[in-house]
Amino acid sequence: GSSPRSGVLLRGCPTHCHCEPDGRMLLRVDCSDLGLSELPSNLSVFTSYLDLSMNNISQLLPNPLPSLR
């Protein structure tokens, strides 16, 4: 289900990534240099920026981030 509208709930931040708010609703997600071989699974639909640099992701499937707007 969708998370309730709130100013005190943190948007989903994938494990080990660093996240920070981007305005009222959005989230900047930094998952760089984590040795990832695939995309993080629990990305918030409110992600405005995603850094996957310095990882081991060799290929992306079509439409790899279906939850993102």
């Epitope: 309730p4 509208r5 709130s6 100013g7 005190v8 709930l9 943190l10 948007r11 989903g12 931040c13 494990t15 660093h18 996240c19 920070e20 708010p21 981007d22 305005g23 009222r24 609703m25 959005l26 989230l27 629990n42």
Partner: antibody, heavy 117, light 107 residues
């Protein structure tokens, strides 16, 4: 700089109501939620509820549902917390605090509310 | 409601010590954890959000870690101004809930 200035200490009798104000300055009032949190003597922090000043949308802690009302006056950048049917367990310091995307970055100085017969 | 259990409730330490405070949630909170500092007569101060993100102006001796239900606040080398009470808070679901606090005192 961001400031949240709360109203002064209150002493109330059981069954009465109290209304605490929180005047915001140093930022755009309608861009941030306002949280209300209380702390009983020697205790931890307890969330009361929150209000979005842009349209007065509220979320309340079920524990206080029906007894608490959060409002804002955007013309004066002031938030209000009214708690009714006061009992001795409501004796606490009440804080307003602004939040954005899940964390509370500035807090008021607190308002002491004492409920005593 | 999610219960947040913080330990220890009080801690005596000396300037220069490394200090660790832990917070355990009653269910997985997916890294949605904040840490706050409270000093008598002063406004509560945000230290860390999203488990590990240092708020602006917070010294780098403070750090946060953890995952799932278990989270840690570490102060690498205690300074005199760090003696205070520390609270964790989960931002995973309503109502947000706080740990009981850890009072850090001078030994």
């Amino acid at each position: 700089q961001v400031q949240l200035v709360q109203s002064g200490a209150e002493v109330k009798k059981p069954g009465a109501s109290v209304k605490v104000s929180c005047k915001a300055s140093g930022y755009t009032f309608t861009n941030y939620w306002m949280q209300w949190v209380r702390q009983a003597p020697g205790q931890g922090l307890e969330w009361i509820g929150e209000i979005d000043p842009s349209d007065s949308y509220t979320n309340y802690n079920q524990k206080f549902q029906g007894r608490v009302t959060l409002t804002v006056d955007t013309s004066t950048s002031t938030a209000y917390m009214e708690l009714s049917s006061l009992r001795s367990e409501d004796t606490a310091v009440y804080y307003c605090a602004r939040s954005l995307s899940g964390y509370v970055d500035y807090w008021g100085q607190g308002t002491t509310v004492t409920v005593s017969s | 409601d999610i219960q947040m259990t913080q330990s220890p409730s009080s801690l005596s330490a000396s300037v220069g010590d490394r200090v660790t405070i832990t917070c355990r949630a009653s269910q997985d909170i997916s890294n949605r954890l904040n840490w706050y500092q409270q000093k008598p007569g002063k406004a509560v101060k945000l230290l860390i959000s999203y488990r590990s993100r240092l708020h602006s102006g917070v010294p780098s001796r403070f750090s946060g870690s953890g995952s799932g239900t278990d989270y840690t606040l570490t102060i690498s080398s205690l300074q005199p101004e760090d003696f205070a009470t520390y609270f964790c808070q989960q931002g995973n679901s309503l109502p947000p809930t706080f740990g009981g606090g850890t009072k850090l005192e001078i030994k």
